[in-house]
């Protein structure tokens, strides 16, 4: 398995590695095999990064940022692979790469520009604030700077805050939406293009159920089939808002098939989840049961927020003892 | 300091084979390749063959096929070019040079005094 | 074989003057090229590699560029110590020189 990098060749001896935070990645070399093959890998062509002649590694002058990091496919330097095995990248390696390589008969160089990108897993949020509703977009490492657009009701909307934190290596954002009052179903894509990566948050309000004291509510909760794959690993989690916090009733983790429940008068149904239908039932509803129902669908590419508001009224028998 | 130091200048007569040497001191000895440059009388310069001192392997200049042998002595660490079967046209004055492989200037980095030879009856 | 080839056989220049010295390869060699200096009865001495970085010890006087199969190595404010003959080299395969260009000062 190839770490998670790939190549754009692009003229002039040069090609472009585009890497990912931390992961391991290959700056790519060939040359026309030949004997006494020398190796020299440099950085922005000042810092050593790698060298190899006499038939081994020599890295006494290697820059230390370096330092255990590097490797060549030393059984494939016969064929003419110079390739340099690179761990661990950190966008502080952003640069360009040169490949020296020398053999009996010829030098070549090869230039390779490294790029790396940051994409922690983005979320969308629903937060209460005062009598204010606010769904937030937020990334909390991301680089380069993402591309960050909102749609209400499939429209794109031009309103898009964003705020925005530097660190040494990255950016953390968020972009909140005052949703007050709004019944419509808001979306929001972060896209990191150097990573050609794309998350969508999807926000949808159902309308209002309005339930007695005792009886039980059925909140449905089904994943739109434009972002939901099944093949890929997600986590189903519902909620409960109550006083502007929201406390988990129950979740659901596609990768090992486990459904923890929080509360005892909730329910899931096995075969509808196996039908990727994730909506729930609660039991025997009290007056503190009103509120705000949450539906979380997560996965690397997506967040699909369900909204639902429920009224649980007192029944006749109740109201008549008071 | 690095020197590369050649033996003095030789005149020898068509036909004889003759051997010059180039001492080499102020760096290691197989880290770096050894080539062997004649410059004729017109003042061009001609790379003949050069030698890995660490594998004890060459690589010549076709038109110097079967002119030079060469060969290193790591412990002294000199390098011997031993020219044959000499003609008036290799009257010149030969070079070694340090061929820089370990820190990618690939280029000739020191050079000997040179030797002069004479071919002459 | 590559070839390289220096135009000019003879450049004479004054004191102060800045000096252009072309050099041009037969086939693209990159950047595989370097710039050596003989002054009368020395041998000759390393300038420029990679085309165009100077090697140490080389004063700023001296510069070298191009890529492929064009190269340029100029001085700038020519000194009476700059009378040599100049040769370039290319390394990209074997090694081949150009004829030289002999520096005179007028």
């Known amino acids: 398995i190839f770490p998670l990098a790939f190549f754009i060749y692009v003229p002039m001896n040069e090609q472009i590695v585009i890497g990912r935070l931390d992961e391991d990645i290959i700056l790519p070399s060939s040359f026309e095999r030949g004997s006494e093959v020398v190796i020299h890998w440099k950085y922005q062509d000042s810092y050593k990064v790698h060298s190899y002649y006499k038939g081994s590694d020599h890295l006494e002058s290697q820059d230390p940022r370096y330092a255990n990091r590097t490797s060549l496919f030393y059984n494939e330097i016969q064929n003419g692979n110079a390739s340099l095995f690179f761990r661990r990248v950190s966008l502080l390696d952003e640069g360009i790469y040169t490949c020296y390589v020398g053999t009996a008969i010829q030098v070549i160089t090869n230039k390779v520009v490294l790029k790396v990108g940051v994409f922690l897993t983005p979320v969308m949020k629903y937060e209460k604030r005062n009598t204010n509703s606010f769904l937030i977009c937020s990334v909390l490492s991301v680089y380069p700077r993402p591309i960050i657009t909102w749609k209400m009701d499939n429209t794109p909307i031009s309103e898009n805050n964003m705020e925005e934190t530097g660190s040494l290596d990255s950016f953390s954002i968020n972009s909140p939406l005052n949703i007050t009052g709004s019944n419509s179903s808001y979306e929001c894509t972060i896209e990191n293009s150097l990573l050609k990566q794309t998350w969508t948050g999807r926000w949808t309000m159902k309308d209002g159920l309005h339930k007695m004291q005792s009886e039980h509510v059925s909140l449905s909760c089904q994943p739109v089939n434009d972002y939901f794959s099944p093949n890929q690993d997600f986590k189903v989690t519902w909620s409960r808002m109550k006083s502007g916090t929201f406390s988990v009733l129950a979740y659901y983790l596609s990768s090992s098939q486990n459904t923890i429940i929080n509360e005892s008068r909730f329910s899931w149904n096995k075969e509808l989840i196996n039908q990727s239908d994730f909506s729930m039932n609660l039991m025997d509803l009290n007056l503190s049961d009103s509120g705000e129902y949450l539906c979380n669908i997560s996965s690397d590419e997506y967040t699909l927020l369900t909204i639902h508001t429920v009224h649980v009224e007192p029944s006749q028998e109740t109201a008549s003892h008071n | 300091e690095i020197q590369l130091q050649q033996t003095g200048p030789e005149l020898v007569k068509p036909g004889a084979s003759l051997r010059i040497s180039c001492k080499a001191s102020g760096y290691s000895f197989t880290d770096y390749i050894i080539v062997w440059v004649k410059q004729n009388q017109g003042k061009n310069l001609d790379w003949i063959e050069k030698i890995n001192p660490y594998y004890g392997t060459t690589t010549y200049n076709l038109r110097f096929e079967d002119k030079a042998t060469l060969t290193v002595n790591k412990s002294s660490t000199t390098a011997y070019m031993q020219l044959n079967s000499l003609t008036s046209e290799d009257s010149a004055v030969y070079y070694c040079a340090r061929w820089d492989y370990v820190s990618t200037l690939f280029a000739m980095d020191y050079w000997g005094q040179g030797t002069s030879i004479t071919v002459s009856s | 074989d590559i070839v390289m080839t220096q135009s000019h056989k003879v450049m004479s220049t004054s004191v102060g003057d800045r000096v252009s010295i072309i050099c041009k390869a037969s086939q693209d060699v990159g950047t595989a090229v370097a710039w050596y200096q003989q002054k009368p009865g020395q041998s000759p001495k390393l300038l420029i590699y990679?085309?165009?970085t100077r090697h140490t010890g080389v004063p700023d006087r001296f510069t070298g560029s191009g890529s492929g199969t064009d190269f340029i190595l100029t001085i700038t404010n020519v000194q009476s110590e700059n009378l040599a003959n100049y040769f370039c080299?290319?390394?990209?395969?074997?090694?081949?020189f150009g004829g030289g260009t002999k520096l005179e000062i007028k």
């Open positions: 990679w085309a165009s």
């Open positions: 080299q290319q390394y990209k395969r074997y090694y081949t």
